[in-house]
């Protein structure tokens, strides 16, 4: 049994880091493998992650972490029984994939303005809370070409757009994702999408 693709990990910079790797053949990850991880710090204890299958030879493990900060560094040991298959390290702050924003809501009761709001996925005491920027994706269910991205570079988790910038009388969907420049993160996953019917009063023409 050998590791074909070494583990690569990403952290949500809050409580979970996800590591993925590939073995050189079909593997029952949960019964055959264990990923041990330990913070390089006074008093830290070794923790064991039981991996799940991710395709025939692929494995994925969700590492639980407390109080993740930039100084943290973890040692990783991948074991198959008594055999050490791979040894490495992981610094969560250097491999951040933010959590997806939640509670995306479209408020259509503001005069001819669409107000989209969502929730910041981090608590106020987390460093990322004040450092997320967002991308809002709006698309038409009727017209695949009607697909647009709005970059929200301010901190407030909201976006206002004129309803007239979208076509009237048809349904739209929206979703939002986040990233943080300070840690050069990847983009988060998209939030679940929300749907609304876009209608507005056409301006009266003489």
């Amino acid at each position: 049994m050998k590791v074909l693709q070494e583990p690569t990990c990403v952290s949500d910079y809050m409580s979970i880091s996800t590591c993925e790797w590939k073995m050189n053949g079909p593997t029952n990850c949960s019964t055959e493998l264990r990923l041990l991880y330990q913070l390089v710090f006074l008093l830290s204890e070794a923790h064991t992650c039981i991996p799940e299958n991710n395709g025939g030879a692929g494995c994925v493990c969700h590492l639980l972490m407390d109080d993740v900060v930039s100084a943290d560094n973890y040692t990783l040991d991948l074991w198959a029984g008594q055999q050490l298959l791979w040894k490495g390290s992981f610094k969560p702050s250097e491999h951040v994939k933010p959590r997806a924003p939640g509670n995306l809501t479209v408020h259509t009761n503001v005069s001819d303005t669409l107000l989209l709001t969502w929730s910041n996925p981090y608590p106020p005491d987390n460093y990322l809370y004040n450092h997320l920027t967002y991308a809002v994706n709006i698309w038409s269910e009727n017209d695949p070409a009607d697909f647009r991205i709005y970059n929200v570079t301010y901190l407030e988790p909201s976006l206002r757009i004129a309803a007239s910038t979208l076509k009237s009388g048809i349904s739209y969907r929206a979703r939002v994702r986040a990233w943080a420049q300070c840690y050069n993160t990847t983009w988060s996953e998209w939030s679940p999408s929300t749907k609304w019917h876009n209608s507005y009063r056409e301006p009266f023409e003489q």
């Epitope: 710090f41 008093l43 204890e45 100084a71």
Partner: antibody, heavy 116, light 111 residues
């Protein structure tokens, strides 16, 4: 919000022991390390040791080895610092502080006076 | 005796900028992260800067931190009378066993 509430001031005789408590609230108690530091009158800060509330493991500054004991009670979210064989130089304000590499939140401090 | 050296005192007038240095070595500041604490008279220390240059929420951007090699600096701009306090740097010693270190402390006087 996070609160670290420490026990009240103590006056002790040389050779005695003192036990200071620090009750935590407003966060997951077992998810954050707790440090103890002290500050003698008019002096700087001095680190004493650390406890992991999750398992109860401890590490102490070499200067206090053998004289200090840190414990925790997860049922009351409280950590304790006991210092024995007190001498006059131990007169100081003792602080608990939550954190790992740095100290996010501090208790208000407990003044321990050692005097004959 | 702390191995992190700070000037015993600094002073400046309201509205001015002041810097406080913290000098260490390769086994502490040079190989670890720096934090800064403010201790107002008669109160407990308070975290001002962590991870060399990050501010906890609620700390105004008048306070900033930097690190270069084996020394670190705290800068305070737009000085206010309420900033008069003792300031301590902190880091970790990584030579043999890891343990936290505090600087000698600096008394800031706002003239």
């Amino acid at each position: 919000q996070v609160q670290l509430v420490q026990s009240g001031a103590e006056v002790k005789k040389p050779g005695a022991s003192v036990k200071v408590s620090c009750k935590a609230s407003g966060y997951a108690f077992t998810s954050y390390y707790m440090h103890w530091a002290r500050q003698a009158p008019g002096q700087g800060l001095e680190w004493m040791g650390i406890i992991n509330p999750s398992g109860g493991s401890t590490s102490y500054a070499q200067k206090f080895q053998g004289r200090v004991t840190m414990t925790r009670d997860t049922s009351t979210s409280t950590v304790y610092m006991e210092l024995s064989s007190l001498r006059s130089e131990d007169t100081a304000v003792y602080y608990c502080a939550r954190g790992k590499w740095w100290f996010y939140d501090w208790g208000k401090g407990t003044l321990v006076t050692v005097s004959s | 005796q702390s191995v992190l050296t700070q000037p015993p005192s600094v002073s400046a007038a309201p509205g001015q900028k002041v810097t406080i240095s913290c000098s260490g070595g390769s086994s502490n500041i040079g190989n670890s992260y720096v934090s800064w604490y403010q201790q107002l008279p008669g109160t407990a220390p308070k975290l001002l800067i962590y991870d060399n240059n990050k501010r906890p929420s609620g700390i105004p951007d008048r306070f900033s931190g930097s690190k270069s090699g084996t020394s670190a600096t705290l800068a305070i701009t737009g000085l206010q009378t309420g900033d008069e306090a003792d300031y301590y740097c902190g880091t970790w010693d990584t030579s043999t066993t890891m343990y936290p270190l505090f600087g000698t402390g600096t008394k800031l006087t706002v003239l």
